[in-house]
């Protein structure tokens, strides 16, 4: 931006300079250009010998300015163009000032004044562009400065050359009031703060309704001496509720929301939240609809699932599969997750309590991800009674809970777990063993082997011990062991059937298990 | 010294023509705007028309446009005025006149020009 | 067009004396006007060209002034060979027009 602090042109003949000596050398004249009339300082003494001609502006208020640019448009016409080439002719002038903190006026001293520089034309009118009316116009600019004092004069020091000026413009250069990155930034006056920096930096101040980013720089610009905006540095952003729109930020419109400040613009509110009010910065919940504390505010509020589906309890001798499918509502989460609790109860007393402490499950059964569990080390004879809920993101925020029950009644001991202890070329000693919990139940063990392949006889040994040695076999020859404990309410759950191997008569004592 | 020398005037019968010269010599001619300046007998000066160094632009004065032609020849040193449709009111002195840019001290040109220099004139009469 | 009033049409004066012509321009011409001296039977002279610039060999007796519509030329110390019919020119338009005479007589 550049402010105008003397304008000879624009003033149409109203400035009154001072010309020194009075009424030579340079004289205001009128021309008609281009069917305008123009004004110009003019003085073409170029055939009377040495000239010391002189032409004072009025004073000039200096306002802020430190450097003011001098930019002048004139004309020079060629010497040669003159009849015996004017032998004192010249084709420059000379450039002044001088500065003052009060008008002289018409008190016009030369020793005042510093040169600025000496003016030629680029370009000198010859004869023939004289004739044709081309004015050959030159435009020169001159910087001045630092400048201290209220105001300044120019002057213009004709020494015999044919000149017009035909435009004299004083000016100083501010950077524009400007607005970037949601910042304003201040006209400022451009000045170099040294000659190793020669830009001006500018803090900027957030618009309404921006701020600046938490842990970011404060809007900055750098103001040259040409009067232009360099390298922004920082910036503002829309505050929560609000969003950029063009230089401005704007509230959130009904049914929008934003929640930190940002570049983003405001999002719709999203699924099952209530309509915002303007300038809303998150959308509340509608009833029984729930937000995790870990949810943004953009994702849909969600419920807590209901009952997993289709619970199923498999009993297999002490053990329990249970098997499950997923809520049919998921509440819009994806994070569900299962608990599974244990109750038994006496089907003497109709005593009921809880059984984690004596039961065990396949995996920990309170963070759930898949589907089924089985639950080992079950009582005979006893009811047991399965819950398995299902639980999201937001079940925490609820009282009620989402289960499904399932009972098994264990009629049987768990199997007993069986091992090959020993082996010879004749015989076989196998051990096994029960739950502690169980072993009191079990009144005698029981034995069945025979040679595999042979279905049509087999022997049985019974103890009450957790051990055997089956003897008077033959070497080198696979049977089939099974164990199965006997209750006093009769058979319990028997063992796989195992396939142990006799030892050949050339001898190992390795044991094939 | 600079001299202008005009010739071809004389009666003529209204409608009728007559062409004007100027012989120009003691100056570079092709550096001269040239023009035509007409006094009417007892009467004030009146200019009548124009034309640059090198023969352009010309320019008219009203009371004389679509009947009178200036123009020049550089290689004979010689301005011409083809007057047509005389009437009576161009009863007249006609002189050439000639200006020269070099010789006026101003840096930029008028918007017209004035007359450095003057012929001695020829006269022209339109009667019946 | 440009008009160009002269006053007076004539005056009388003697020699030695100061004489002065004024010419009206019927809008601004700025100085863009010129004297001329006719006498009878003869083409006319310049004197002054923009106003107040007096042509090579005029003598320094003659002397113009003014601008924009108000002109004058001055005769300081009136000579024997000054008496003579004085025209105003202006060139600021290019229908150059002529002011109608002002005629200085002997007394």
């Known amino acids: 931006k550049e402010v105008v602090l003397l304008d000879f042109a624009a003033m149409k003949g109203e400035l009154g300079w001072l010309t020194h000596p009075y009424g030579k050398g340079w004289d205001l004249m009128q021309n008609i250009m281009d069917d305008m009339p123009i004004y110009m300082y003019s003085v073409c003494n170029v055939v009377s010998g040495d000239q010391d001609n002189w032409l004072r502006t009025n004073w000039v208020y200096r306002e802020e300015a430190e450097r003011i640019f001098i930019e002048l448009k004139f004309t020079v016409r060629d010497c040669n163009s003159f009849p015996g080439g004017a032998s004192s002719c010249k084709e420059t002038f000379n450039l002044y000032y001088a500065e003052s903190d009060v008008d002289y006026g018409t008190n016009f001293q030369k020793r005042q004044f510093t040169k600025i520089d000496t003016i030629a034309p680029d370009e000198i009118t010859v004869s023939s562009d004289f004739e044709a009316r081309n004015v050959k116009l030159n435009v020169e600019e001159r910087m001045v400065g630092p400048l201290t004092r209220k105001g300044f004069y120019l002057a213009f020091q004709d020494i015999g050359a044919c000149v017009a000026l035909l435009s004299v413009r004083v000016y100083y250069k501010k950077c524009p009031e400007m607005l970037q990155s949601l910042a304003r930034f201040p006209e400022t006056i451009a000045v170099a703060v040294s000659d190793t920096q020669p830009l001006a930096t500018v803090a900027g101040t957030c618009v309404d309704h921006a701020v600046v980013p938490y842990g970011g720089e404060g809007p900055l610009m750098h103001c040259t001496v040409d009067g232009e905006w360099l390298v922004p540095i920082g910036q503002c952003l829309c505050q929560e509720g609000y969003e950029k729109v063009e230089d401005a930020c704007r509230a959130c419109s009904p049914g929008f929301f934003k929640s930190e400040a940002s570049e983003s613009p405001c999002l719709e509110c999203p699924e099952h939240t209530l309509p915002s009010t303007e300038g809303a910065t998150s959308c509340q919940c509608e009833e029984g609809y729930f937000r995790a504390p870990e949810d943004p505010l953009s994702m849909s509020c969600t419920r807590p699932p209901s009952a997993p589906n289709y619970l199923t309890a498999i009993g297999m001798g002490a053990k329990v599969e249970l098997r499950w499918t997923a809520p049919k509502d998921t509440g819009g989460r994806q994070d569900i997750v299962y608990s599974v609790t244990c109750e038994q109860c006496w089907p003497e007393s109709g005593e009921c309590g809880p059984c984690e402490a004596s039961v065990r499950y396949s995996e920990p059964p309170h963070a759930l991800t898949r589907t089924s569990v089985t639950v080992s080390d079950l009582e005979p004879h006893m009811n047991y009674t399965f819950a398995v809920e299902a639980r999201n993101g937001v079940s925490g925020l609820v009282t009620s809970r989402s289960f499904r029950t399932a009972s098994v009644s264990i009629n049987q001991t768990e199997p007993p777990k069986v091992r090959l202890e020993d082996r010879s070329t004749t015989s076989l000693s196998v051990t096994w063993s029960i739950p502690v919990s169980q072993q009191s139940r079990v009144w005698k063990y029981e034995v069945t082997y025979r040679k595999k392949g042979d279905a049509n006889s087999y022997n049985v040994r019974r103890t009450e011990g957790f051990s055997v040695t089956l003897d008077d076999l033959a070497p080198d020859t696979t049977y089939l062991v099974q164990v199965q404990a006997l209750t006093q309410e009769g058979q319990g759950a028997g063992s796989k059937v195992h396939e142990f191997q006799t030892l050949s008569t050339e001898g190992s004592a390795n044991m094939a298990v | 010294e600079v001299q202008l020398l005009e010739s071809g005037g004389g009666l003529v019968q209204p409608g009728g023509s007559l062409r004007l010269s100027c012989a120009a010599s003691?100056?570079?001619?092709?550096?001269?705007?040239m023009a035509w300046v007409r006094q009417a007998p007892g009467k004030g000066l009146e200019w009548v028309s124009r034309?640059?160094?090198?023969?352009?632009?010309?320019h008219y004065a009203d009371s004389v446009k679509g009947r009178f032609t200036i123009s020049r020849d550089n290689s004979k040193n010689t301005l011409y005025l083809q007057m047509n449709s005389l009437r009576a009111e161009d009863t007249a002195v006609y002189y050439c006149?000639?200006?020269?840019?070099?010789?006026?001290?101003?840096?930029?040109?008028?918007?017209?020009?004035?007359?450095?220099?003057w012929g001695q004139g020829t006269l022209v009469t339109v009667s019946s | 067009d440009i008009q160009m009033t002269q006053s007076p049409s004539s005056l009388s004066a003697s020699v030695g004396d100061r004489v002065t012509i004024t010419c009206r321009a019927s809008?601004?011409?700025?100085?863009?006007l010129a004297w001329y001296q006719q006498k009878p039977g003869k083409a006319p002279k310049l004197l002054i060209y923009?106003?107040?610039n007096l042509h090579t060999g005029v003598p320094s007796r003659f002397s113009g002034s003014g601008s924009g519509t108000e002109f004058s030329l001055t005769i300081s110390g009136l000579q024997p060979d000054d008496f003579a019919t004085y025209y105003c020119?202006?060139?600021?338009?290019?229908?150059?027009?002529f002011g109608q005479g002002t005629k200085v007589e002997i007394k």
């Open positions: 006149a000639g200006y020269d840019s070099g010789y006026d001290y101003v840096a930029v040109a008028g918007p017209a020009e004035y007359f450095q220099h």
């Open positions: 003691g100056f570079t001619f092709s550096h001269y705007m």
């Open positions: 034309i640059g160094p090198s023969g352009g632009p010309t």
């Open positions: 809008q601004s011409i700025s100085t863009w």
């Open positions: 923009k106003a107040s």
């Open positions: 020119q202006q060139y600021q338009s290019y229908s150059r027009t």
